[in-house]
Amino acid sequence: RGVFRREAHKSEIAHRYNDLGEQHFKGLVLIAFSQYLQKCSYDEHAKLVQEVTDFAKTCVADESAANCDKSLHTLFGDKLCAIPNLRENYGELADCCTKQEPERNECFLQHKDDNPSLPPFERPEAEAMCTSFKENPTTFMGHYLHEVARRHPYFYAPELLYYAEQYNEILTQCCAEADKESCLTPKLDGVKEKALVSSVRQRMKCSSMQKFGERAFKAWAVARLSQTFPNADFAEITKLATDLTKVNKECCHGDLLECADDRAELAKYMCENQATISSKLQTCCDKPLLKKAHCLSEVEHDTMPADLPAIAADFVEDQEVCKNYAEAKDVFLGTFLYEYSRRHPDYSVSLLLRLAKKYEATLEKCCAEANPPACYGTVLAEFQPLVEEPKNLVKTNCDLYEKLGEYGFQNAILVRYTQKAPQVSTPTLVEAARNLGRVGTKCCTLPEDQRLPCVEDYLSAILNRVCLLHEKTPVSEHVTKCCSGSLVERRPCFSALTVDETYVPKEFKAETFTFHSDICTLPEKEKQIKKQTALAELVKHKPKATAEQLKTVMDDFAQFLDTCCKAADKDTCFSTEGPNLVTRCKDALA
């Protein structure tokens, strides 16, 4: 509502340059280009960014100068379409350039690739990193933005600027230390982990927006904001949700300058109106812009008002329930979601949205009956199984995580998901299981009342990625079924899947389980991925293998690796012991 309503500007590009400042302007343009054209090199993009920046400066000097009145989509699209060899490098994406705005931008968006065939982003060793950082910090950070943005084409742009700033601060601090490596590694690993989570969360928001529209995203925002700011009134929450929806719509739509500018405005508004929003904002509001906006996005929940009446009073027992519902359905359901969410910071947003959906369906049915109160009178009791299901999921999985540790927990999930969808490619299953398995480390150590929202909302974001990858090459009916429903039903749908009985087991191929001495020198993470790849292949061969059988084989495999990697002649060990391992595996699974 109005936070973003500004007077019309003659030149949009000059306006955004002035609002954002040169550094952020350049960073955002680089991110935008890298997310659209994911195969171009840093140098190619850096050249375009400089040209756009120079042009923006001419418009700042004279808003009436040639082309300064053009829309950002027109200016950026023209730049991208002028790249030489576009068709050779990008194939049918070049067809976008035959279209006019806004269709051209829509076309670019449709060609964003969630799984680009780019090598993993390898971190150079500490000395080399520090040398290139010291030589040219701007270019170094530019490379970081480019490499992350092209691999994550929906990364929340203003948040990526925040992570780049964190990266910069870590390098500034650690490159001055004697032992650069031990200073850098844990800190940069921490930033990387947080950034990867941020990426899947934002991709989920964009999926919500793309598949179900602004209304769906706004419902998500109302629930989330009501949990965090239980003392804010409904009008305040509605206002914040409307503004947050606009910011996310802009970023998901590739309007990164507008998105970052509006996000800064929203942060400013929140800090100027703490009294009516939350008592917990001051610490965030004392920080500089990027840190402030990041801090506000994950601020702790305010203390719940002590005197909130039971939800039943106004939404079940009140005689006017059907009248209020009929009068303005969206408004009444919005107030229900607000009231329920502010009372339940211990629930996931997905669960809150499922409850609101259940409430809506109940009113839809009951308000058409002869005696509505008798019909909807039990609605809160009917919420119980919906609440119990994710609570049980959290308990079961956190117990398993505590028993097995992260790696073992990932393996348990890998087996489970390979049985549910054995047609899915092994690399996708391994990536999904590793990500799903991290939920243990991330959430199971939290206090009881924070576990459920952490677990379920994280799992939903990871499963959204599974759906996006599966959409490109649909192979499993199970996955298609779960992915084509509503976003909030996905996680329960995947959890309910059992062994796919239609699957014809893969024939046993010895080469799939043949390993060489080069595995010994791999970093621990890569070793784990190799072993998990073998585990998924075993399950595809024997989908109904018992946990005991799989454990026997995997223990044998681990022992084989340990023995051969310690052997004086590793190659001989692998070539002689390998076939024996394969034979034992076949016998164990027979």
């Epitope: 009134d233 409904f234 009073a313 009444f332």
Partner: nanobody
Framework: EVQLEESGGGLVQPGGSLRLSCAAS????????MGWYRQAPGKERDMVAT???????YYADSVKGRFTISRDNAKNTVYLQMNSLKPEDTAIYYC??????????????WGQGTQVTVSS
């Protein structure tokens, strides 16, 4: 009897002004955020402006700078001053009361609506 009664609607030319009033009876006015929503034919009912019990105001983007909401707690009345009216402001305007405190009284209360038509 608990009710909201709107008045002030009518036909006005583009660029003209109107002032809507909504009088509340039978409820503790100070416990309610008051607002104006509008509904055009075949559309959802959308928020136009809201005023909280503390007097904080919120506006839809489409009316910001043209409409002003205010309340007079002594008269149990909320107003919507509408200036620079446009044809797209044509709709039925509804007054709404939304209970903000834990005292009894209806949680949500709507008026019957008043028609605003902007046309030359």
């Amino acid at each position: 009897e608990v009710q909201l009664e709107e008045s002030g609607g009518g036909l006005v030319q583009p660029g003209g002004s109107l002032r809507l009033s909504c009088a509340a009876s039978g409820l503790t006015f100070n416990d309610y955020a008051m607002g104006w929503y509008r509904q055009a034919p075949g559309k959802e009912r959308d928020m136009v402006a809201t005023i909280s019990i503390g007097g904080r105001t919120y506006y839809a983007d489409s009316v910001k700078g043209r409409f002003t909401i205010s309340r007079d707690n002594a008269k149990n009345t909320v107003y919507l001053q509408m200036n620079s009216l446009k044809p797209e402001d044509t709709a039925i305007y509804y007054c709404v009361a939304h209970r903000q405190t834990v005292v009894r009284g209806p949680y949500l209360l709507w008026g019957q609506g008043t028609q605003v038509t902007v046309s030359s």
